[in-house]
């Protein structure tokens, strides 16, 4: 059920997945919504404790029952992810945060006119996830007008502190406002040998690309197809980056495909949700439920309507066996990162993903079309 | 494959599950062997680092491939669990550790003649997991001959420090040497409302009892059967304790069963492994693999032979459908605690557990029979 209300001075007890730092409860909910497993969150507002290092903590939570006990806690703000909600979602966050310093790896600094220009610089830099700008009111005269571009492994600040005279905010790449090159090509028989940030399992290079696009630090990827000679690496999607922002080493290898994140693109195609069905394919993962349904579409809908379901495998009924009742078996599944733990073939399953992330695509497409 | 050799001055890189403290590499391997997911370990011997708080750390590890990269590290000792080995296993550890203080909750102290008597006191106390005894050489005269009985949430010390004049060791309950009452009755229509240490999912009260017996702090349990009115609590096994060591609150409720840990018993029946098959029952969990095999016994054997497999669900082939090939489908599964995440009925599966823990039962039974 969709709960949009937030609960002031309330903390959810238990169910912790991880803690990140966000400048507001609204942004905390955004992070929770896009996290593969988060269903609930507790945000520790400024002055929520005597220890300022605990302020702005956004505690991401999960629960098998989709609910957690509420306890009183001064300064805490709790609520539910929008996974359970029908409305459109966007990763785009245009808000700027006054007198907050969002800490990260400061990899670039320059003098610019105002905070808006600093945000544009961040949006047009491949690595930049968020920025801090020292305004004309910043106490240290030498640092005024300084624009710091930042990134972290997670895409959220490592900590957030109060600091007078600064303004912080996030890159607007996800608002479709980046002016960097958008490379939509997928290159066959190509391995990129740059730094691997992470690896996930994916059924094809398009899903691999979407996962890269959705990942905070992925700039390009290499995908090993089902025909890749090394069995243990089949369906492996390597998420990659480099200092320059471009691949440095391109190697020709059969049955591998490579390409780029679509984070700089104005999307007319889905980049978050994976709507396809994969025939004669089993997605392995942690099982949530088994239900009898008619057809793979109903199975996908059942998965989409279950807030914890990330992907599914559907086994059609054998036609000869039970002509009367043509229901098949629908296995609802999840994993720690939203991707299958393994992909198998030749066992007769039809697999696919929850469509709940499609809500993000449409809004993005809608927002960008007029441009 | 079974690897009994340990690797000196070697650490396994990555794959960390958790860190516990153990007095020796041998005991670390024992903990790893009995942990539901541990396949490899790295033990930090005394003087392995400049920081004595890191000595005696036993880092439990897992790996999808069952191997991890080895790196040089002075004072580290690494090796593999005995899960992969055919030999008998025992949780029984009679060793005592000279000049080591194993830290825990000191809940009872008394003056006794020697370390053996202290170990016997620990063995005959429901809560005691390990002890520290101050010998006649202990620097503080007032504390000499003092026997401290200890427990922790995990059953292993919270830390271990060097301390001259003390001897430490573990309870010998698992050696079948406890003189406390062994209550084998399972009480129908009974709920015990004492402190819950943990809750797991189990197919029946016997498995629930075995899990309680195997758990470091469980003294008794309540199990909600398939007929329990509240659906979300069906098959729930509540692991319990109390200060007195006995249940304080017994409430009559249909479809609940309660009983005691068998940790004080001289076992003539399996208490670690769950050999039964559960018909028309699906065990849900994290999927490892799907293989086509003939019969549920072969499925169980396949699970037992896979070091990471904890339980399975087997779907027999439809007789009418494919008379020629009578293989069914065997789903190999695991979870964080070794128990299914859910149990479902009416879907035609036959489920059961890996038999690798049976190796522990036999040795125990053999050891105890002569008494």
């Amino acid at each position: 059920e969709c709960v949009t209300k937030v609960f002031k001075d309330i903390s959810f007890q238990g169910g912790d997945l991880s803690t990140v730092f966000t400048p507001s409860a609204t942004y905390c909910r955004l992070v929770c919504t896009h996290h593969p497993r988060c269903l609930l969150f507790t945000f520790m507002a400024e002055s929520s404790s005597d220890d300022p290092t605990k302020w702005f903590a956004c505690i991401l939570k999960d629960s098998v029952t989709e609910i957690l006990p509420m306890v009183n806690m001064t300064g805490a703000i709790s609520g539910y992810s929008f996974k359970q909600c029908p409305q459109q979602l966007s990763t785009c966050s245009k808000d700027v945060y006054v007198n907050l310093d969002m800490k990260g790896m400061n990899y670039n600094s320059s003098v610019v006119k105002n905070a808006r220009e600093c945000q544009e610089r961040c949006t047009d830099d491949a690595h930049c996830q968020f920025f801090t700008y020292a305004t004309g009111y910043f106490p240290s005269v030498d640092h005024r007008k300084m624009c710091l571009l930042k990134y972290t492994r997670t895409g959220t600040p490592t900590t957030i502190t109060k600091l007078n005279g600064v303004v912080s905010g996030f890159s607007l790449k996800s608002c479709g406002l980046s002016n960097l090159a958008c490379i939509r090509d997928i290159f066959p028989n190509t391995v990129l040998a740059d730094l691997n940030i992470d690896s996930v399992v994916a059924p094809d290079a398009f899903v691999c690309r979407r996962i890269c696009t959705h990942h905070p630090t992925c700039l390009f990827f290499t995908f090993f197809s089902q025909a890749w000679p090394k069995e243990s690496q089949r369906h492996l999607c390597l998420l990659k980056t480099s200092e320059s922002g471009l691949p440095s080493t391109r190697i020709t290898k059969s049955h591998a495909l490579s390409g780029f994140s679509l984070q700089h693109c104005r999307h007319s195609v889905p980049v978050f949700c994976h709507p396809s069905f994969y025939n004669d394919t089993d997605f392995l993962g942690e099982e949530l439920d088994i239900v009898d349904v008619k057809g793979q579409e109903t199975c996908q809908k059942t998965c989409t309507n279950n807030a914890r379901c990330q992907f599914f495998t559907y086994y059609p009924s054998h036609r000869l066996c039970n002509e009367r009742n043509r229901r098949g078996r629908c296995y609802l599944k999840l994993s720690s990162n939203g991707s299958p733990t393994r992909i198998l073939h030749g066992r007769g399953g039809i697999s696919g993903y929850s469509l709940r992330l499609c809500k993000m695509d449409n809004v993005c497409t809608t927002k960008i079309n007029p441009r | 494959e079974c690897v009994t050799k340990v690797f000196k001055d070697i650490s396994f890189q990555g794959g960390d599950l958790s860190t516990v403290f153990t007095p020796s590499a041998t005991y670390c391997r024992l903990v790893c062997t009995h942990h539901p997911r541990c396949l490899l370990f790295t033990f930090m011997a005394e003087s392995s680092s400049d920081d004595p708080t890191k000595w005696f750390a036993c880092i439990l590890k897992d790996s999808v491939t069952e191997i991890l990269p080895m790196v040089n590290m002075t004072g580290a000792i690494s090796g593999y669990s005995f899960k992969q080995c055919p030999q008998q296993l025992s949780t029984c550890s009679k060793d005592v550790y000279v000049n080591l203080d194993m830290k825990g909750m000191n809940y009872n102290s008394s003056v006794v003649k020697n370390a053996r008597e202290c170990q016997e006191r620990c063995t005959d106390d429901a809560h005691c997991q390990f002890f520290t005894y101050a010998t006649g050489y202990f620097p503080s005269v007032d504390h000499r001959k003092m026997c401290l009985l200890k427990y922790t949430r995990t059953g292993t010390p919270t830390t271990i420090t060097k301390l001259n004049g003390v001897v430490s060791g573990f309870s010998l309950k698992s050696c079948g040497l406890s003189n406390l009452a062994c209550i084998r009755d399972i009480f129908p229509n009974t709920v015990l409302a004492d402190l819950n240490i943990d809750s797991v999912v189990a197919p029946d009260a016997f498995v629930c009892r075995r899990i309680c017996t195997h758990h470091p702090t469980c003294l008794f349990f309540t199990f909600f059967s398939q007929a329990w009115p509240k659906e979300s609590q069906r098959h729930l096994c509540l692991l319990k304790t109390s200060e007195s060591g006995l249940p304080s609150t017994r409430i009559t409720k249909s479809h609940a069963l309660s009983g005691f840990s068998l940790q004080h018993c001289r076992h003539s029946v399996p208490v670690f492994c769950h050999p039964s098959f559960y018909n028309d029952t699906d065990f849900l969990g994290e999927e490892l693999d799907i293989v086509d095999v003939k019969g549920q016994e072969t499925c169980q054997k396949t699970c037992t032979n896979n070091a990471r497999c904890q339980f399975f669900t087997y779907y027999p082939s439809h007789r009418l459908c494919n008379e020629r090939n009578r293989r069914g489908r065997c789903y190999l599964k695991l979870s964080s605690n070794g128990s299914p995440t859910r149990i479902l009925h009416g879907r035609g599966g036959i489920s059961g557990y890996s038999l690798r823990l049976c190796k522990m039962d036999n040795v125990c039974t053999t050891k105890i029979n002569p008494r």
């Epitope: 029952t65 | 819950n196 009115p229 509240k230 729930l236």
Partner: nanobody, 126 residues
Framework: QVQLQESGGGSVQAGGSLRLSCTAS????????MAWYRQAPGNECELVST???????YYADSVKGRFTISQDNAKNTMYLQMNNLKPEDTAVYYC????????????????????WGQGTQVTVSS
């Protein structure tokens, strides 16, 4: 979101009475086992009284004959009538549903399907 809300706590002299109420939202009492637990500072959470879905009641030895548990299914409310209160009854009292025992000695941790209220303070002075 299931919520259990206690009320009726307060301060009272030894020998006095209080009536605690527990009201549930998004939840019906009919098929649930309801209970009152309490936790005094530095102590474990302890079961005070239970009323099961089939109407059975249980009382801890320390409160037998002084406390009475009841419920009004129409109002979705459970009560604990506490008479002849003693200083040792001082604690935070928690209402719970389908919760057989507390976890970690704390009257808030639940296992699947179990629920706790936020608690109401009862102080009995001599």
């Amino acid at each position: 979101q299931v919520q259990l809300q206690e009320s009726g706590g307060g301060s009272v002299q030894a020998g006095g009475s209080l009536r605690l109420s527990c009201t549930a939202s998004e939840f019906t009492f009919d098929d649930s086992d309801m209970a009152w637990y309490r936790q005094a500072p530095g102590n474990e959470c302890e079961l005070v009284s239970t009323i099961t879905s089939d109407g059975g009641t249980y009382y801890a030895d320390s409160v037998k004959g002084r406390f009475t548990i009841s419920q009004d299914n129409a109002k979705n409310t459970m009560y604990l009538q506490m008479n002849n209160l003693k200083p040792e009854d001082t604690a935070v009292y928690y209402c719970a549903a389908d919760q057989w025992g507390s976890a970690e000695g704390d009257c808030t941790s639940s296992y699947p399907g179990g629920y706790w209220g936020q608690g109401t303070q009862v102080t009995v002075s001599s």
